[in-house]
């Protein structure tokens, strides 16, 4: 039985040009966590194995840095970084559990600073 | 040219273990991963993990954990892989294989040894 | 782990014919699907990798296509050095699970 919660950053705003730091943290489980990816609508940004370490996608090497811990920095935000985020954590023996992060990219300084986890 | 070499085959008793070497030439050694493939009589392409030649780091699949070991000597560009506690169902091929992009693994496994045939019988 | 099911299973097919292997994810893979072409007491080959990108080397007749679960190697004009059994992978998550494999015989 998957017993497991994913606490995420969920809502989450920054200012355009800047960074921001997506973040999913699992508890209430004892399952091994092997591997957690990261993804944009369907599309793979990251993969942090538990093994091997960190594999950025190329189309993303630019822009995206590993961490902190098992989260995700996004630098160098554009308008078009606007959307759902989500970490998939593959776990042994529960399976996979998927946190959700929405980002709203702002043009101006309009962004909220209340996100736990936003780089200023 | 990029080319890697396994050792010989080898016969073993139930029980015993054996140890595959993979001499890597031709790259720079520490830039890619390596995988190791087997491959019984007749059967498919069984993948048992993959090590980071520079770090050192691995991955075993989990059918293999407890029993398979891999290691490198970075000074003579060489992967091993020892598999222990051997039975008769691990007689097969084994083959090593390197990542094709450096420093990563999920684009496949581009250059391969020739295979090193391994029988387990009493 | 993730299982990787391949269709069919063997083949016989002709010089000429287009041939078309399919491959099923157990979940999605995204696009982290290679293809092999192995022969008799040789090692595999990389055809493909990343689900579409030609492997250097490998003729333009090979082809693959697909995302998340669903994927296609497609050989366009079947030439007589591509009898051979073909195997897909993920190289998603560990362990890179093999599919069963297609072997592809002349008719």
């Known amino acids: 039985m998957m017993t497991g919660t994913i606490e995420t950053t969920g809502n989450i705003s920054a200012e355009k040009g800047g960074s921001i730091i997506l973040q999913c943290h699992l508890s209430s489980t004892t399952a091994q966590v092997t591997q957690v990816n990261w993804e944009q609508q369907d599309q793979l940004l990251a993969i942090c194995n538990a093994d091997l370490g960190w594999h950025i996608s190329p189309s993303f090497k630019d822009r995206v840095a590993p961490g902190p811990g098992l989260g995700l920095t996004l630098q160098s935000l554009t308008v078009n970084d606007t959307g759902e985020y989500f970490c998939i954590y593959h776990t042994y023996p529960d399976g996979t559990y998927t946190g959700r992060i929405f980002l709203e990219v702002l043009e101006s300084s309009v962004a909220e600073h209340g996100a736990r986890f936003q780089i200023p | 040219q990029v080319q890697l070499v396994q050792s010989g085959a080898e016969v073993k008793k139930p029980g015993a273990s054996v140890k595959v070497s993979c001499k890597a030439s031709?790259?720079?050694?520490?830039?890619?991963?390596m995988g190791w493939v087997r491959q019984a009589p007749g059967q498919g392409l069984e993948w048992m993990g993959i090590?980071?030649?520079?770090?050192?780091?691995?991955s075993y699949a989990r059918k293999f954990q407890g029993r398979v070991t891999m290691t490198r000597d970075t000074s003579t560009s060489t992967v091993y892989m020892e598999l222990s506690s051997l039975r008769s169902e691990d007689t097969a091929v084994y083959y090593c294989?390197?990542?094709?992009?450096?420093?990563?693994?999920?684009?496949?496994?581009?250059?391969w040894g020739q295979g090193t045939t391994v029988t387990v019988s009493s | 782990d993730i299982q990787m099911t391949q269709s069919p299973s063997s083949l016989s097919a002709s010089v000429g014919d287009r041939v078309t292997i399919t491959c099923r994810a157990s979940?999605?893979?995204?696009?982290?699907l290679n293809w092999y072409q192995q022969k008799p007491g040789k090692a595999p080959k990389l055809l493909i990798y990343?689900?579409?990108s030609l492997q250097s080397g490998v003729p333009s007749r090979f082809s693959g296509s697909g995302s998340g679960t669903d994927f296609t190697l497609t050989i366009s004009s079947l030439q007589p050095e591509d009898f051979a059994t073909y195997y897909c992978?993920?190289?998603?998550?560990?362990?890179?699970?093999f599919g069963g494999g297609t072997k592809v015989e002349i008719k």
């Open positions: 294989a390197r990542a094709r992009t450096p420093s990563s693994w999920p684009y496949g496994m581009d250059v």
């Open positions: 031709g790259y720079t050694f520490g830039s890619y991963y």
């Open positions: 090590i980071d030649p520079s770090g050192g780091r691995t």
């Open positions: 979940q999605s893979i995204n696009s982290y």
């Open positions: 990343a689900a579409s």
């Open positions: 992978q993920q190289s998603l998550l560990t362990p890179f699970t």
